[in-house]
Each structure stands twice: as C-alpha cells, then as structure tokens.
Amino acid sequence: SPVPFGPEGRLEDKLHKPKATQTEVKPSVRFNLRTSKDPEHEGCYLSVGHSQPLEDCSFNMTAKTFFIIHGWTMSGIFENWLHKLVSALHTREKDANVVVVDWLPLAHQLYTDAVNNTRVVGHSIARMLDWLQEKDDFSLGNVHLIGYSLGAHVAGYAGNFVKGTVGRITGLDPAGPMFEGADIHKRLSPDDADFVDVLHTYTRSFGLSIGIQMPVGHIDIYPNGGDFQPGCGLNDVLGSIAYGTITEVVKCEHERAVHLFVDSLVNQDKPSFAFQCTDSNRFKKGICLSCRKNRCNSIGYNAKKMRNKRNSKMYLKTRAGMPFRVYHYQMKIHVFSYKNMGEIEPTFYVTLYGTNADSQTLPLEIVERIEQNATNTFLVYTEEDLGDLLKIQLTWEGASQSWYNLWKEFRSYLSQPRNPGRELNIRRIRVKSGETQRKLTFCTEDPENTSISPGRELWFRKCRDGWRMKNETSPTVELP
C-alpha cells in the first residue's frame, strides 16, 4: 500500500500535484557558477557560446568542476541542502568551479512531467560540457556531476550524451518512481561516467520507494540498510524539523544522502567506511566487515574509484547527525552448549571497554536465532573511538525486563511447570574491528565459569595470545 500522508493525502497525490499556478513557462536550464562562499551572492550565469562570463567570473579551466543537479521540487525554490553542499565543496576544493544546474522551471511540475524533462536537462548539461571541452586545458576527467534524487538520473543522461566520458557521477539517493527496473539508458548506470558512486538512503520494500532500490553505480552504498535513517523517526522530526509530519520523515531520510556527502567533504578526518555485502540482513549479522579485495571503501567524496565487473552493494551504520562516522565491530560468539532454552530467544547486551573510552550498553541483534554448538556472529557499533579493546561485559537480559519475553516465559512455564533455569555456555568472543581490521580474542575471566543465564553477566578479557592479525588491509583513506 502507498505511504500515507496524513491529512494532506497520499504520497502519490503529492507526486502529481504542482504547487504553483503557472503561466507560460520558458523551458530553461541555467548554469550558475557559484563564485563566492557567500550563499546570498547571485553568482555568474554561464551559457554555451559565451566566453566572457568564464573570464569575468574566473572559471578555472584546469581545476575540478562540480555540477550540482537538484531534483523534483514542490516549492519552485532551491532547497536548503543546496547551499550546504555548495559551501562544503568550496571549503574542501578551494580552486574548484562549482556550478549549480538550475532546472527549477522544468522540475516544478507534476512528478511525471519532471521525469520526462530529465532527458532534456541531461542534454543541456552535455551541450555545456561539449562546449567547455573546446576550451584549452578543460578536461572531462575533472568533471564531477553530483545529482540528488531526480537530479541523479539527469546526471546519468548528461554522462550518456556528452562526447567523451565524465570523470565521476555521484548519485545522492537517486529517484525511484518511474526508474526502478528501467533500462540502463533511461536511468543512472555505471557506463555514464568513469566512476559512478551512489548513496541510497530512502529505499522501501513496501509502499512507494522514493529512492531507487536497485544498484545503479559501480558502488552502491546503503547506509543503515538504505531505509530507516537514525534521527529521522517521527519523534525526532517532531522535535527538531519544521512540520513534524510523515512528509518530513520522508524528506529527512531522502535528504540524508546529501548530508552524508557533505559530511565526507567537511569531516575528512572522520571518514565513514562501508563494507561490501550481498544484502542488509547479512550485514546486520556482522558477516561483512572485510576490507580484502576492495571489499570496503570510504563513502561520499573520499570514495576510492572501483570499477567492478558488476555492481558492488555496500553497507554501513551511521550516527543520527554529523559527523556520521561510527565504529563497526564483528562479534563472534561460540555457544558450545545451552540448557532449557524453550522458545525464547535470549536478549544479549555487550559493553566494550577500551583504552580511549567505554561504550554504552549495546544490544546484540539476533537476526535469526542463536545456534548451539556453532559460532554466532553479531554486528555492534559505537559512536566513539574506544581505542584498543581491553574487556567485554556480556549481559543476558532478565525475562522481566521485557514484557514480550515475560509473556513467553509465562507460556513456557504453563507448558513445562518444572522447567529448570535456562543457561548458556560461552568460552570466548572473537572481535574484529571494521575500521582497523584488527582481530582480537576475548576469554572468560574465570575459565571455570563460562555459563550465563537471564539477569546475569559474564566478563571477558583479552586472551593471552593477544592481537591476532590476518593479512588484511585496513581501510585507509585515499583522497581523490
């Protein structure tokens, strides 16, 4: 069913409802060279065949050139994220040319009409690039197209139509409706640039997915699984953002891609890393924290160029705001026996103690179920850099702490009144840091005491063999 939109109607209605009463529209695409970090400055307008503005506005032919391409608009004005991105690019690449592609008149339409206009806008950008290529020292390899939502597909068209190959296209949550499953020439795809990297932040497997779910680049990064973004829940939105409606939740999650990219520009000392994985569930299990064979990468501007034979889906967790970086850990817990488990899955928490800091109490998400006589893998992440890990506290939540478990406990008791206490035996926990790729084994403090039961805790310290390093590379940041 479609995503509800409260009293304002459904999302589909919003997609097809123009905000403005329109008189005759001059179909237009403008290229605004942002000449100043001051967001209020009017900038310079470039047009094909007119070289004077290039000279007047000090267009740097040898520098990087960014084209920022907005998406569909309900208001007809530039959204506030655009100025953040312009400012971040100016901060990071002081000599670069930052060009805003203004296609507001063609984007401020019914969603379906705006989609149909993307091809025209792509052609306009390609013509501008073809003209710039005629100038000495201008290289298409220095061109980086950054498209948000519908703008990502505009970038794809531009890359497809231009004579030659642009250096890079970044798709920031490319639009989903009317593009999901489309032919590669009718959407952003890997052959539109030398390197196409994509951030997916609003994908939904139910209802209407605002962002495209399918991978469309050389690397496709799905922060927090590509769907529910921290800090964008209805409660968060009610407290901080205008409206506080489901509309704003959608906007928050969709726009998160832009903020992750901005974060990568302004907080390059705090890079976020994504890890290759076949799907979100496997990532949540902690299986995919390897950096071998290019299996991890920085996200956003600092992403290393990877031209894979097929799309590479990558995942990571993030904080709710800038800086978005978190520290990922894979925890392998070998359960060698358990007693009287019944039908209740245990609820485990870990606290990590490090040389720099201690973590909060972190839940171990059981994606499927705890397996006996097997190694169970979990993903945990912390917002702070703990340094080298020293010890781990594992806690089994008591049944009374969870109403759901209390009910299951009661049902279990009714069926087996003399059910003795449940117990699990764990000798060691193996931990791998995603960010450093270091592996460490932790053993129980008391080798004789390896059992844990509801409401109890078990302490683990670094085993005597200390750090165990495999021949794996850590995700070093290679700046573009």
Epitope: A20, T21, Q22, T23, E24, V25, K26, S28, R30, N32, R34, D38, P39, E40, H41, E42, G43, Y45, S75, G76, I77, F78, N80, L82, H83, K84, V100, D102, L104, P105, H108, S240, I241, A242, Y243, G244
Partner: antibody, heavy 120, light 111 residues
Framework: QVQLVQSGAEVKKPGASVKVSCKAS????????MNWVRQAPGQGLEWMGW????????TYAGDFKGRVTMTTDTSTSTAYMELRSLRSDDTAVYYC?????????????WGKGTTVTVSS | DIQLTQSPSSLSASVGDRVTITCKAS??????????MHWYQQKPGKAPKLLIY???NLASGVPSRFSGSGSGTDFTLTISSLQPEDFATYYC?????????FGGGTKVEIK
Amino acid sequence: QVQLVQSGAEVKKPGASVKVSCKASGYTFTNYGMNWVRQAPGQGLEWMGWINTYSGVPTYAGDFKGRVTMTTDTSTSTAYMELRSLRSDDTAVYYCARRGYYGRRYFDVWGKGTTVTVSS
Amino acid sequence: DIQLTQSPSSLSASVGDRVTITCKASQSVDYDVDSYMHWYQQKPGKAPKLLIYAASNLASGVPSRFSGSGSGTDFTLTISSLQPEDFATYYCQQTIEDPPTFGGGTKVEIK
C-alpha cells in the same frame, strides 16, 4: 544603485482590477526573484506571492490564488502584479521586493509602495 | 504555514535605552546551523528596510547598535542604545519555507 520603482497610486471600484508595475534597475533583473507584499492601513505585512523572473513561473499565496496574476517583461526589467475582483479590504499599500534565488532568500530591496484604494 | 509571534506589540522607550524585541516561531526555522529568520524596520509612510538577516547578520549600512540573536524558534532583536531615528515598527520574517511569513510587528514609540 539598485532600486525598484513602482507605479503611482490607484483608486478602484469594488469588482474592478488593478495592475501595479515595478521597474528594476541597478542589477540583472533575471538574477533575483520578485515578491509582492501588501500592507492594509494600520496592519502588518502580508506576502502575496513571487515570480521567478527568469522562467516566468509565479507562485501565489493560498489566499490570493485565482485572483492574482504575476508577470514580468524581461526586456524592460519590469514585474507586474494584477489583482482582480477587488474588495474594500484590498485597500492597502502594495510593495514589490526582490529576493535571491540562493541562500536564505530574505527581501533585501523594496519598492516605495503603491497605494491602492478600493471604494465605491 | 509557520506563525511568528512578536512581543511586545508596542513599547515606549527613551533615547539611550536598551530595547529588546522577541519573535517566536511556531516551529523551528533552522536548517543545520543556519537560521532563516530576518528583521525589518518600517517607518510611517515608508517601505520596510532589511536590518538583520539570518538571525544575527547586520545588513549593509545598518548601524552596529542593532543586533540579532537566537536559533530554532526563539529570536531577539536588540537595540543597544536607542536613537531618535530608531522610533519605528519592527517585523521579523521567516524564509525557511514558502510562504514566507511575517510577525505582527512591534511599534517602538517615544516615552
């Protein structure tokens, strides 16, 4: 210097229409949007809408939809606001004010205002 | 639409006084670290004039005795030492979303 020059005062009968002009000078007309704001006697400021001077696309405030038309003539750098089916409560000073397409979109330059009196 | 409530609606003050006017928005007018709140001065029979933009930035040609502060939903315009030419009506305005809206105004009169 940057300025917006508005047309002179108008006296209209209820049901009639009025068209106010705003001629811009000292800057590139199409590089800024044009807003229209009105102020009834002794009252506050009320935004009526704005027009993208490059594309000619207007956006109207809900209270004025269907009754107002905003247009531009880029050859003379002039913006126009026409209000139809005038009522006595449309008696006000009508201002044009420019705002940037970029940044925080405040109204940095205002016309002196055009007084429109609606009286039978 | 975002509602802006100014207080007081009018005040009487003397030359040299410190004057503070507040503006409260019905919801946040911040985007990241930017505030989309602005202040205008209007004298009788004249057009409004931009005083402060983005909560705290002084517009070109505006004397330094005017200052703005605040974030989120609460904003303040301060005149550190009131001058004879400052007797006017002051309006706050938000532009974080269309429609832009104005506060009801604060009339500063001579005591």
